[in-house]
Structure formats: structure tokens, C-alpha cells
């Protein structure tokens, strides 16, 4: 006899970076019949929602109108089915952006380089921060952390086209809060003509979330699809 | 901007009853959910009921049976009615608002507040 249902999914919308202030959705999705779901935050019960009706809805949505620095961190959801509850969710990370600063970013020798040169990111934050993190932008979105007193360094190794592309860095103050993003930088790489194809796109993400990002710093604009899968969060961990 | 103020706070004895308000300005009240905290002296805030847009609510344990949350969207007010009040129960009682929000919402987690009101004082006593 099943002792638990399955877990249910859980993802931000439209990002889980979100800027201090603006808003964002956590939605969590499990099984028609739910009913009742519950979000919990960093081990505890954060909110509750009962769908209405059960039987027509699988999915519910939690929504955060103000971001802070207090609400940045793990959640994961459950689903009741009668007196049955479900596995726990998947941990979404989700991270507050736009605190404090604003770091610099640098690229060596420059962000025009041939296919094969070493290439080698410098992210710089001068406020208390140990963290730095360097984001590509685009489909794929990878993290990649570093660690340095006021400055890191992220090598590249010999680059390829696929690393051509916008960069952008953040300091991190802890896992869940991150400065504003720096400026971009553009790294052009020329190679010869049959390493220039299309750099493969991670299927896992099915949008440009930089872009989404972009739109939830600039306007605050809410989307009623999901842009990112609960797997974008293992970019975290 | 969202402001709350409580009222309805007092000495009672313990098994006796109060009944808090909680008045809210402006016109998104609607679209607010509704939480009552409360905080001892000496002692960290804590949830006690919560009700969504749409009237469902949420209990402490230590409250499910005694205490009942509910609102009237014409006079943009919450209550929090408590009998079979104890010793334990004293402390300052908060107000919350979570402003806007979707329909079933109910937030019982006080990080989830973006408004808050300034208190009102219940003191169970022999």
C-alpha cells in the first residue's frame, strides 16, 4: 500500500533571482484531488493554500509581492490527497539580487580572442564578500562560483565558440543574496570555419531566463508560464 | 501604502474571552491576506492564525479550538476572536498584511508580511 504520494514540482516565475522589492511567484504542482498544499521555507511551514476545485486543479501558486533578504533561501512543497501526503519537492533556491553593490567585470587578454587562447574572467566587488559568481547569459545560464577576498578569478581555459557570448557577475554575501548584477561583458571568439557552428543549448531550460531576469529588474513584469524547471536550481548546489 | 492599527487588547481572566480588530486603510484590503502574531515578553514572534482573500484559514496548534480568524471586506477590518484564554496566551498581538496576493493564499510564515500593525496588549490573569 503507497504510504506517500508523488512529489510534487516546484519553480519561480518568472525567475529565481529576484531583485529587492519586486515580486515573484512560486508555484507548485502535483496531482488533480489536491487538497491542500503547503510551501515551506528553510525547514518551516511558510504558506498554505487550498485549491478550489480540487478536482479541476493540479497546480497552485504562491505569491511573494515584495522580495527581501528574509525571504531568500530553500523551499520545497508538499500536497495532501484525503489524509495522504506527498513526498517533499525538489529545493528551490531562490535568491534575493541588488543588494549593496555593484561588482566590476573584467576579462584577460581582452573579449576579442582566438579560438584556443586561455581566457580568464575577473569579477571585483570591493564591499565585505567572499563569494563572486559568473553567470553566461542565455538558454543555458551557468553558474559558475568563485572565491576571493575583494576579487575572483574564473578561468576559462582554452575557449572555444561555445563560450562566445554576454557575462555578467555578481558578489554573493551569502548563498541566497547577491549584489546587483555588474555590467555586461561581451566575449567574441574567432575560430576557423568548422568550429563556428551553434554552441549546443542546454535542454533543461526552455527560455532566455537572463532576458526574464532583465524584464524582473526592469519592470517587475510577472509571467503566467514556467521559465525555469525545478533542475535549474542543482546550478546552485 | 497599507496601514493597520489593533485594538481590542486588555487584562482578562483566564477561560475568558477578548476579541481583537484590526483595522486596515486603503483600498487593497480585498486583495490582502490577513495574519494575527504574537509575541511574548522575552520571547520570539509567533504565527497564530491566518486567513486568505477567500475566508480559508490556518491555526497555531496551540490556538485550533479557542482562537477564530475572520474579516469583513466592507469595513476593511480582521478579527481575531480568543476564549478559554490562559496564562500562556499573554503577550502583544500583531496584525499582518501580505499585500497583494492570489486568492487561496494563507501565509504563516511572518517573513511572507509586508505590513504590520503596531500591537495590542492581552494579559490573561487570575
Known amino acids: 500500500q503507497q504510504q506517500t504520494l508523488p512529489k510534487p514540482f516546484i519553480w519561480a516565475e518568472p525567475h529565481f533571482m529576484v531583485p529587492k522589492e519586486k515580486q515573484v511567484t512560486i508555484c507548485c504542482q502535483g496531482n488533480y484531488g489536491a487538497v491542500e498544499y503547503q510551501l515551506h521555507f528553510e525547514g518551516s511551514l511558510f504558506a498554505v493554500d487550498r485549491p478550489k476545485p480540487p478536482e479541476r486543479i493540479n497546480k497552485v501558486k504562491f505569491y511573494i509581492p515584495d522580495m527581501n533578504s528574509r525571504m531568500a533561501g530553500q523551499y520545497s512543497c508538499i500536497y495532501r490527497v484525503g489524509e495522504l501526503w506527498s513526498e517533499p519537492s525538489n529545493l528551490l533556491d531562490l535568491v534575493v539580487t541588488e543588494m549593496y553593490d555593484t561588482p566590476t567585470l573584467s576579462v584577460h587578454p581582452g573579449p576579442e580572442v582566438i579560438s584556443g587562447e586561455k581566457v580568464t574572467f575577473y569579477c571585483r566587488l570591493d564591499t565585505a564578500t567572499s563569494m563572486f559568481l559568473l553567470l553566461k547569459e542565455g538558454r543555458s545560464s551557468h553558474v559558475q562560483r568563485g572565491y576571493g577576498k575583494v576579487q575572483a578569478e574564473f578561468p576559462l581555459g582554452p575557449v572555444t565558440t561555445a563560450h562566445r557570448g554576454t557575462y555578467r557577475c555578481f558578489g554573493s554575501y551569502n548563498n541566497h543574496a547577491w549584489s546587483f548584477p555588474s555590467e555586461p561583458v561581451k566575449l567574441l571568439v574567432t575560430g576557423d570555419i568548422e568550429n563556428t557552428s551553434l554552441a549546443p543549448e542546454d535542454p533543461t531550460f526552455p527560455a532566455d531566463t537572463w532576458g526574464t531576469y532583465l524584464l524582473t529588474t526592469e519592470t517587475g513584469l510577472q509571467k503566467d508560464h514556467a521559465l525555469w524547471d525545478h533542475t535549474a536550481q542543482n546550478l546552485l548546489r | 501604502e497599507v496601514q493597520l492599527v489593533e485594538s481590542g487588547g486588555g487584562e482578562v481572566q483566564p477561560g475568558g474571552s477578548l476579541r481583537l480588530s484590526c483595522a486596515a486603510s486603503g483600498r487593497t484590503f480585498a486583495s490582502a491576506a490577513m495574519g494575527w502574531f504574537r509575541q511574548a515578553p522575552g520571547k520570539e514572534r509567533e504565527f497564530v492564525a491566518a486567513?486568505?482573500?477567500?475566508?480559508?484559514?490556518y491555526y497555531a496548534e496551540s490556538v485550533k479550538g479557542r482562537f477564530t480568524i475572520s474579516r469583513d471586506n466592507a469595513k476593511n477590518t480582521v478579527y481575531l476572536q480568543m476564549s478559554s484564554l490562559r496564562a500562556e496566551d499573554t503577550a502583544v498581538y500583531y496584525c499582518?498584511?501580505?499585500?497583494?496576493?492570489?486568492?487561496?493564499?494563507?501565509?504563516?510564515?511572518?517573513?511572507?508580511?509586508?505590513?504590520w500593525g503596531q500591537g495590542t496588549l492581552v494579559t490573561v490573569k487570575p
Open positions: 486567513i486568505s482573500r477567500s475566508d480559508d484559514t
Open positions: 499582518a498584511a501580505v499585500v497583494p496576493t492570489y486568492g487561496n493564499n494563507i501565509y504563516v510564515h511572518s517573513a511572507a508580511y509586508n505590513y
